[in-house]
């Protein structure tokens, strides 16, 4: 039996290897039964995670899911970081799992480091 | 029915690769975790890594990282374990996983593939 | 690394029988969403270990309702509360917070 709650689908530890300089949306897939709730995203700052206020968002919607847009556009060095995506649902605020970005600064093409690379070099971004 | 089944294992010799593959379905692969998992005769179980099919984001253990590479085919529902320079004492059966991501709602295990090591 | 340890390593007992297997973690296993992501695993000789227990205390589809898990941060318990001839293999505590993963050595329970 599907569940009517709302369910947000980001992976739990899910990582992005980004370049700075580039265009970036950052997907929070968003299943709901009727009303589509209000989502928000924010950035973790230790254990506390900032609303973003102003920055451009937008929805997509396919038939079984809908995906709430964060838009990088373009992505800066400082987006560096961790970001979670909240619904808030008959008075209840779902939060998702944190997804975090690893921005490196822009390099010539055939330079740019693997996403294995990425992943076991996380002093590239600072 | 949900099934992860490995294959590729044998006996190879040392200093020599071998590409295991994990073939899945009953799920979608972009939903979940793909794990490599090994255990020596005898011995406990040990995290080779892991692999997100949804963007090919990889992740592995100190000893593996260099030496292992964890790769999978989101369209073909396929995940691999590509070991190179083997030693006799990567003699193991290997095991892929596949853990839903979001809400842990399933953990399935192949039944495993055994690589021997020797000349 | 996270180092994961069992206790037993091994354990005679009988159909019936009420078995607590222990596993004490190196450091918490708290996640920043609150959550421990400990799980319990079954193997038996020759085949393929199976999850049992994920979230600490959150039974798998299909295990029995004799197994539990239960603990909070670095402490960690599986319990059977009777034991049945099938419960009879080697149970693996492993972690999945922190990068690497890691694994008990396993607790090998055999019948008396």
């Known amino acids: 039996k599907e569940s009517c709650d709302v369910q947000l689908y980001i992976k739990r530890q899910s990582e992005h290897s980004i370049l700075a300089g580039d265009p970036f949306e950052l997907e929070c897939p968003v299943k709901y039964c009727a009303n589509r709730p209000h989502v928000t995203w924010c950035k973790l700052n230790g254990t506390t995670c900032v609303k973003l206020e102003d920055r451009q968002t937008s929805w997509k919607e396919e038939k079984n899911i809908s995906f709430f847009i964060l838009h990088f556009e373009p992505v800066l060095p400082n987006d560096n970081g961790s970001y979670r995506c909240s619904a808030n649902f008959q008075s209840n605020l779902i939060e998702s799992h944190s997804t975090t970005l690893y921005v490196t600064d822009v390099k010539s093409a055939s330079e740019r480091p693997s996403k294995d690379e990425m992943a076991s070099r996380p002093w590239l971004l600072y | 029915e949900v099934q992860l089944v490995e294959s590729g294992g044998g006996l190879v010799q040392p200093g020599r690769s071998l590409r295991l593959s994990c073939t899945t379905s009953?799920?979608?692969?972009?939903?979940?975790?793909i794990h490599w998992f090994r255990q020596a005769p005898g011995k406990g179980l040990e995290w080779v890594g892991r692999?997100?099919?949804?963007?090919?984001?990889?992740k592995y253990t100190a000893s593996f990282k260099g030496r292992a590479t964890i790769s999978a085919d989101g369209s073909k529902s396929i995940a691999y374990l590509q070991m190179n320079s083997l030693k006799t004492e990567d003699t193991a059966v290997y095991y892929c996983a596949s853990y839903e991501g979001y809400y842990e709602r399933f953990g399935y295990w192949g039944q495993g593939t055994l690589v021997t090591v020797s000349s | 690394d996270i180092q994961m340890t069992q206790s037993p390593s091994s354990l005679s007992a009988s159909v019936g029988d009420r078995v607590t297997i222990t596993c004490r973690s190196s450091?918490?296993?708290?996640?920043?969403?609150?959550?421990?992501?400990l799980n319990w695993l079954q193997q038996k000789p020759g085949k393929a270990p199976k999850r049992l227990i994920y979230?600490?205390?959150k039974l798998d589809s299909g295990v029995p309702s004799r197994f539990s898990g239960s603990g909070s941060g670095t402490d960690f318990t599986l319990t059977i509360s009777s034991l049945q001839p099938e419960d009879f293999a080697t149970y693996y505590c492993?972690?999945?917070?922190?990068?690497?993963?890691?694994f008990g050595q396993g607790t090998k329970l055999e019948i008396k």
């Open positions: 979230l600490v205390s």
């Open positions: 450091q918490s296993l708290l996640d920043r969403d609150g959550k421990s992501y």
């Open positions: 492993w972690q999945d917070t922190h990068f690497p993963y890691t």
């Open positions: 009953g799920f979608n692969i972009k939903d979940t975790y």
């Open positions: 692999n997100d099919p949804a963007n090919g984001n990889t």
